[in-house]
């Protein structure tokens, strides 16, 4: 057994542009409160029941009235920790949901109005008994800063709160079969403590607080003999006393579900189906009314005026579950285009785009040349996940902004000399060669290999290449 503790440090506008409007005004003063929901395991599926590890509601914070024209500051917070007690082992990995609620204190008919301001969720690994872990989560334009820890309640110790420790009865050593309790070397591991009142003759336990019955006995404390009517559904070995089959110990024996919950066996353990108004692994969290705000994500709570009456959450579109704690899988509609990966962040859908695509739904193809200017008369060519420029003569680089050295590639053949020119390059050919690149030899008889030299040019003149 132990307690999960959550300390809210601040709730206010996050960094960056688009600061949120203050949730309160002079006409509508308000105050904040927080709700935390814990589930065991790292995946949503790990906790079929809502808030299976428990839930807690903070006190209401101080009343806040916005100063006209002032930006939304960090808002005044409720005092104290949010504490979620857990009766069984701490799972080590858990999922959390923290909701920030606003209670408007204007003159509404029917009392204060509640609305959900922000909701953050996450999955974490945490060992019980460790130091406070700090966290920052953002929901839209809001930012929530908080710390959390899990601590064991004595006599439980360890990272899962499953080991029990007692002060040593003798100063030198622990009892037979019991080890010292690290790091509390002055204490000893204690034998398992079964559920209070569990029959020492007919009951036993494998977990603290449990009471499992030996053959022939039943009831929450294993004090009731099994009647012969139980022979109708045999499961265990024959009983010598009654001469019929009686159930052997099973996970639902003694009904671990509290508050009228019904128990059903699962391959590894059991599952409680809780009546309305109760939740938790064993339906042990009780007394929830609409005043406690049990409906997440803006769900509307109906009924449940007192702890004995049931409440029902009417969920807004996109949410489901008995407490509106589960989000509908909106990504299954595949809104992201061009192979983008869909992420449901709760307040919005986001698409993680493949290379070469951009936009909220990856709808923009970066390969197209729209809006991509190539300088100095270059032309844009599509392909390869990014635009490419085919540059005009004398220019180079990604956007044709760099002036190219036309002589760098040594374009003049047969020892011709290259000169850079504003419109290209000029080759001054060595004796015996001619042509734009000095590529044609001049024959000994004075005739060129060309059919004819252009008028006005003699062999050996520099050839200007346009």
């Amino acid at each position: 057994a132990g307690v999960f503790e959550l300390q809210i440090h601040s709730f206010g506008p996050g960094p960056g542009p688009g600061a949120p409007r203050s949730p309160c005004s002079a006409r509508l003063p308000c105050r904040l409160f927080f709700r935390v929901c814990l589930k065991p395991g790292l995946s949503e599926e790990a906790a079929e029941s809502p808030c299976a590890l428990g839930a807690a509601l903070s006190a209401r914070g101080p009343v806040y009235t916005e100063q006209p024209g002032a930006p939304a500051p960090d808002l005044p917070l409720p005092d104290g920790l949010l504490q979620v007690p857990f009766r069984d082992a701490w799972p080590g990995t858990f999922s959390f949901i923290i909701e920030t609620w606003r209670e408007e204190l204007g003159d509404q008919i029917g009392g204060p109005a509640w609305s959900l301001l922000a909701r953050v969720a996450g999955r974490r690994r945490l060992a019980a008994g460790g130091p406070w872990a700090r966290d920052i989560q953002r929901a839209g334009a809001w930012e929530l800063r908080f710390s959390y820890r899990a601590r064991c309640e004595p006599p439980a110790v360890g990272t899962a709160c499953t080991r029990l420790c007692r002060p040593r009865s003798a100063p030198s050593r622990c009892g037979p079969g019991l080890r010292p309790c690290a790091p509390l070397e002055d204490e000893c591991e204690a034998p398992l403590v079964c559920r209070a009142g569990c029959s020492p003759e007919h009951g036993f336990c494998e977990q603290p607080g449990e009471c499992r019955c030996l053959e022939g006995w039943t009831g929450p404390l294993c004090t009731v003999p099994v009647s012969t009517s139980s022979c109708l559904s045999p499961r265990g070995p024959s009983s010598a006393t009654t001469g019929c089959l009686v159930p052997g110990p099973g996970p639902c024996d003694g009904n671990p579900c509290a508050n009228g919950g019904s128990c059903s066996e699962t391959p590894r353990s059991f599952e409680c189906t809780c009546p309305r108004g109760f939740y938790g692994l064993r339906c042990e969290v009780s007394g929830v009314t609409c005043a406690d705000g049990p409906c997440f994500n803006g769900g509307l709570c109906v009924g449940g005026a007192d702890p004995d009456s049931a409440y029902i959450c009417h969920c807004p579109p996109g949410f489901q579950g008995s407490n509106c704690e589960k989000r509908v899988d909106r990504c299954s509609l595949q809104p992201c285009r061009n192979g983008g990966l869909c992420l449901d962040l709760g307040h919005a859908l986001r698409c993680r785009c493949r290379a070469g695509f951009a936009g909220p739904r990856c709808e923009h193809d970066l390969d197209d040349c729209a809006g991509r200017a190539c300088a100095n008369g270059g032309t844009c060519v599509e392909g390869g996940g990014a635009h490419r420029c085919s540059c005009a003569l004398g220019f180079g680089g990604r956007d044709c902004r760099e002036r190219a050295d036309p002589c760098a590639a040594r374009p003049c053949a047969h020892g011709g000399r290259c000169y850079a020119h504003f419109s290209g390059l000029v080759c001054a050919c060595a004796p015996g060669y001619m042509g734009a690149r000095c590529e044609f030899p001049v024959h000994p008889d004075g005739a060129s290999a060309l059919p004819a030299a252009p008028p006005g040019l003699r062999p050996g003149d520099p050839q200007r290449y346009l």
């Epitope: 909106r330 595949q334 809104p335 992201c336 285009r337 909220p360 739904r361 709808e363």
Partner: nanobody, 120 residues
Framework: EVQLVESGGGEVQPGGSLRLSCAAS????????MGWYRQAPGKQRELVAG???????IYAESVKGRFTISRDNAKNTVYLQMSSLRAEDTAVYYC??????????????WGQGTLVTVKP
Amino acid sequence: EVQLVESGGGEVQPGGSLRLSCAASGFTFSINAMGWYRQAPGKQRELVAGFTGDTNTIYAESVKGRFTISRDNAKNTVYLQMSSLRAEDTAVYYCAADVQLFSRDYEFYWGQGTLVTVKP
């Protein structure tokens, strides 16, 4: 603000057919993805059929060959033709749309749902 209005639900016998319609209306918007989800009592809401952002058609495995989704772009409407209906198709059917608004932002909208009951 965009509204999605479903119609066409009702009670039908096993093997029968129904045609659901979902019309989108509101100020300037364009539809990116649109389709149908359903939620049976005590179950999670699941996608039945839809047009994806890439305009592909997708179907849940359990309805392939029996349900057909179609659309009329001019009317901003999608249809779900359901045939060979079974008892396990009984659910509230919700229209859903991922929409680009005039502001260029995208929003995901849900209809209020229409009940389909399949029983002898």
